[in-house]
């Protein structure tokens, strides 16, 4: 595999990480799969720095980040794991509501308009943010 | 310039396989995600199968799905779409095409004519 | 899957014709919706990204617009070289899915 060492082109570097953040909405299952296209995965927030610098560039708007229960337990999209991890949840959520009417609970996390971070459904169509990491070799399968 | 070459159409019998390869130059073909499109004769466009640039991530449509298999080759900016257990209904003409940051395709290449008969 | 459907499916017109073509997706879609131009045993040229964003290139007389699920494409002054099969895509969700298509003729 080739070794990425700069940032494509319309993506940000912060700490060794290359960050795209998107102007228009998707569902949380459409964005993850835009970010994997990308060759990168929806955004894993590990630190308060790392925090306030994606609510830096969101601003006050609803955004998917790669965090969801939808098999259970919390999880990050990479395999971070999450009860050790950095959480900004907003008072009293996560809290799984079912009084949307939309049908089920609440399975994805996004920043909210102050960035702290909330449960909603996976369906609403929200920006999102996409992270690779720097320094790590792309994952190119052999030909058969 | 940028270009997209498909080869490796033809006959072949129901049941039978392909290997259909698209040559890309002119931009940096590693960064990008790729597609292959098909279209039957006198049909609209079908989307078929989508790489990511690394050809870590592919999607493919319900039709194909465990038939077809897209892989890439970023040393020779080569895209292969292997295709097995080919059925009439899989007759078109392919294009592997680039995918943009909007999730659409900007170049296509000219085509390449695939047809599946007894 | 999300659906496309374009109407109507041809329209005949003369050089200098105003033409609009509607696309319509079975969902909303926000404004993931690409227009393509195709012409016989040709690939298709994307005109239009983001449901407006006229690709670099493609003449101004070709407008798109549109925001959810209902989208148009304008020619405000039609010329000889846009007699064509002119189609959608959506590219909000997987798997990415064309509208049947337009065929603009020659009245």
């Known amino acids: 595999g080739s070794e990425r060492t700069c940032c494509p082109v319309n993506w940000v570097e912060h700490e060794r990480s290359c960050y795209w953040f998107s102007r228009s909405g998707k569902a949380w299952a459409d964005a993850d799969n835009y970010c994997r296209l990308e060759d990168a995965h929806l955004v894993v927030v590990t630190s308060w720095e790392e925090q306030k610098f994606v609510q830096h560039h969101i601003g006050p708007v609803n955004t998917w980040m790669g965090l969801h229960d939808q098999n259970g337990p919390w999880k990050w999209v990479d395999g971070t794991d999450y009860e050790t991890g950095f959480k900004n949840w907003r008072p009293e959520q996560p809290d799984d509501w079912y009084g949307h009417g939309l049908g089920g609970g609440e399975d994805c996390a996004h920043f909210t308009d102050d960035g702290r971070w909330n449960d909603d459904v996976c369906q609403r169509p929200y920006r999102w943010v996409c992270e690779t990491e720097l320094d790590k070799a792309s994952q190119e399968p052999p030909l058969l | 310039e940028v270009q997209l070459l498909e080869s490796g159409g033809g006959l072949v019998q129901p049941g039978g396989s392909l290997r259909l390869s698209c040559a890309a130059s002119?931009?940096?073909?590693?960064?990008?995600?790729m597609s292959w499109v098909r279209q039957a004769p006198g049909k609209g466009l079908e989307w078929v199968s989508v790489?990511?640039?690394?050809?870590?991530?592919?999607f493919y449509a319900d039709s194909v799905k465990g038939r077809f298999t897209i892989s890439r080759d970023n040393s020779k900016n080569t895209l292969y779409l292997q295709m097995n257990s080919l059925r009439a209904e899989d007759t078109a003409v392919y294009y592997c095409?680039?995918?943009?940051?909007?999730?659409?395709?900007?170049?296509w290449g000219q085509g390449t004519m695939v047809t599946v008969s007894s | 899957d999300i659906q496309m459907t374009q109407s109507p499916s041809s329209v005949s017109a003369s050089v200098g014709d105003r033409v609009t073509i509607t696309c319509r997706a079975s969902q909303g879609i926000s404004n993931w919706l690409a227009w393509y131009q195709q012409k016989p045993g040709k690939a298709p040229k994307l005109l239009i990204s983001a449901a407006s964003n006229l690709q670099s290139g493609v003449p101004s007389r070709f407008r798109g617009s549109g925001s959810g699920t209902d989208f148009t494409l304008t020619i405000t002054s039609l010329q000889p070289e846009d007699f064509a099969t002119y189609c959608c895509?959506?590219?909000?969700?997987?798997?990415?899915?064309f509208g049947p298509g337009t065929k603009v003729d020659i009245k």
């Open positions: 790489t990511s640039g690394s050809g870590g991530t592919t």
């Open positions: 002119g931009f940096i073909f590693s960064s990008y995600a």
């Open positions: 895509q959506q590219a909000n969700s997987l798997p990415f899915t």
């Open positions: 095409a680039k995918r943009t940051q909007f999730d659409d395709f900007d170049i």
